[in-house]
Structures are given as structure tokens and as C-alpha cells.
């Protein structure tokens, strides 16, 4: 659900963190319409997710902790 590198909506699936290698934050006040977390998967896919959903926050936290501990 993205266009010109902007997410236009969110996935309705819950992604398992084992498939996710990183993420990018999309901010609505920086040229896109909505706030989003863009998850980057092992298969080189980009998935737009709702930053308010708990599963999304949880994965962002897990990935952030990994980066901090590297």
C-alpha cells in the first residue's frame, strides 16, 4: 500500500518478527499523508504497518534493542 515511497494504508496481517530485518518510520508531516512503520522483510518486501498497533510497536522495540546491542 505505498506510492512514490509513501504508505497510503496499512497491512491487515500481523507479521512475525523473524521475517523482518529492519524498519523505516514514515511521518505524516514530512511529505506523506499518514504516519506509518515500513517493515523491511528478508524477501526484500516493504510492508506498511500501523504505528499505533501493539504488535507493530513491539517489533519496532525488538529491532531497536537489537541495534543498540550491536
Amino acid at each position: 500500500a505505498s506510492n512514490f515511497d509513501c504508505c497510503l494504508g496499512y497491512t491487515d496481517r500481523i507479521l512475525h518478527p523473524k521475517f523482518i530485518v529492519g524498519f523505516t518510520r514514515q511521518l505524516a508531516n514530512e511529505g506523506c499523508d499518514i504516519n506509518a512503520i515500513i517493515f523491511h522483510t528478508k524477501k526484500k518486501l516493504s510492508v506498511c504497518a500501523n504505528p499505533k498497533q501493539t504488535w507493530v510497536k513491539y517489533i519496532v522495540r525488538l529491532l531497536s534493542k537489537k541495534v543498540k546491542n550491536m
Epitope: I14, N50, T54, W55, K57, Y58, S64, K65, K68
Partner: antibody
């Protein structure tokens, strides 16, 4: 209606470990996060850690990272919290609480009744 | 020391309106929604307000929540004796300390 049933009160010696359980009934286990929140006598609430069972990856508050292990058994819909190297200030009621992970809020909408853990020196 | 700051106590007489404040920072209340819990003596906490101002079914509309910047507040109008309880605010925290942070709690006394 979902309920969270917790194991009974425990009395432990300082330096030992305790394992508390929280069993979910009445709903699927796939869209939950289960957190553990503790309350020392006369004090406020403190988040200890949590797990999303379908991810099978636990997360812990910084204060507890070295001493707590949270795990889930999807077959029995039970989440466990094990606290090691117990100290007298770990004496508290330990609550489990549910969050629905697909909603756009992170509230604990259902709570267990609590398990009193008493640590004696 | 709790991450979110609440007054330790509040009081009011039946029928009055009482407000409880909750102050945080940009990493918690400033960038996430606030939830409020009511804890009656000797019982588990109960969800009272979620997503700043939403009431779960069964919670009377006497209870309302609001958020502005890095602060939030819980208002109770038409105070009743059964409202005597401890009230806790909570929010997700984007720092790596712990994702869920609570206020220290406010003991509400109905005079």
C-alpha cells in the same frame, strides 16, 4: 468472555526463584500480548515484562532483564513468569494482563486476580 | 520513582467533579496514547479509559479522559462513594527502558 487465571500464592526464601502462571480461557491465544505487572505492598504498578505468544519472544523492563524469564505454552494457553535471585523487595502481588495486539491501543483490557509472592530472608 | 507523575492524593464530596493529572515526556505521553486504570481496595486494576478518552463498555460516562502535549487528565463528575479507589495512568514509552510506564497512582477519597 476471556479470563486470566493465575496460580496461587508463594512464599520463597531470598536467593531462590519463583514461577507464576497465567492461563487464558475463553478466546484464541493468537492475538494477545500478556504482560506481567507487579505491585509491592502499599505501592504503585510496575511493568515487569511481557510476551506475544505467537511471536514467542519476550520483552523485559530494563530493571528486570537479568532476573526474569517469561515464556508461553500455546497448547495450554498459559504464560509463565519466572523471577530469579529473589530479594525481600520482590515481595509483591504479580498480575498478568492482556493486550489485544491488532487494535490501535495498547491498553490492558483484562487482568488476572494477582498472585502474592512473599520473599523471606 | 515512577516515570509518569501523578498527585498522590485527591478528594471530593459526593456530586462534585474531581480531576487527576498525569505528566510525562515526549517519549511516552507526548507520542503515545494514555490509558487509565481504577483499582478498588484489594482487587486487580480495571481498565477505565483507553486511547486518551475512550471508555470501555460498562464504564459510566461520568469518567472522561483528555490529553494535551505531554500531560493527560482524568475527570470524574458526579462523584460517588464507590469511586473511592486508586487511579493509575499508563502509556507506552518509546525509550528502551520498558515499553509500558505507569504513574505512581492517585488515592481518591470521597469525603
Amino acid at each position: 468472555q476471556v479470563q486470566l487465571q493465575q496460580s496461587g500464592a508463594e512464599v520463597k526464601k531470598a536467593g531462590s526463584s519463583v514461577k507464576v502462571s497465567c492461563k487464558a480461557s475463553g478466546d484464541t491465544f493468537s492475538n494477545f500480548a500478556i504482560s506481567w505487572v507487579r505491585q509491592a505492598p502499599g505501592h504503585g504498578l510496575e511493568w515487569v515484562g511481557g510476551i506475544i505468544p505467537v511471536f514467542n519472544t519476550a520483552d523485559y523492563a530494563q530493571n528486570f532483564t537479568d532476573r526474569v524469564t517469561i515464556s508461553a505454552d500455546k497448547a495450554t494457553k498459559t504464560v509463565y513468569m519466572e523471577l530469579h535471585s529473589l530479594r525481600s523487595d520482590d515481595t509483591a502481588v504479580y498480575f498478568c494482563a492482556r493486550t489485544k495486539i491488532e487494535l490501535d491501543n495498547d491498553a490492558f483490557d483484562i487482568w488476572g486476580r494477582g498472585t502474592l509472592v512473599t520473599v523471606s530472608s | 520513582q515512577s516515570v509518569l507523575t501523578q498527585p498522590p492524593s485527591a478528594s471530593g464530596t459526593p456530586g462534585q467533579r474531581v480531576t487527576i493529572s498525569c505528566s510525562g515526556s515526549s517519549s511516552n505521553i507526548g507520542s503515545n496514547t494514555v490509558n487509565w486504570y481504577q483499582q478498588l481496595p484489594g482487587t486487580a486494576p480495571k481498565l477505565l479509559i483507553y486511547s486518551n478518552n475512550q471508555r470501555p463498555s460498562g464504564v459510566p460516562d461520568r469518567f472522561s479522559g483528555s490529553k494535551s502535549g505531554t500531560s493527560a487528565s482524568l475527570a470524574i463528575s458526579g462523584l460517588q462513594s464507590e469511586d473511592e479507589a486508586d487511579y493509575y495512568c499508563a502509556a507506552w514509552d518509546d525509550s528502551l527502558n520498558g515499553p509500558v510506564v505507569f504513574g505512581g497512582g492517585t488515592k481518591l477519597t470521597v469525603l
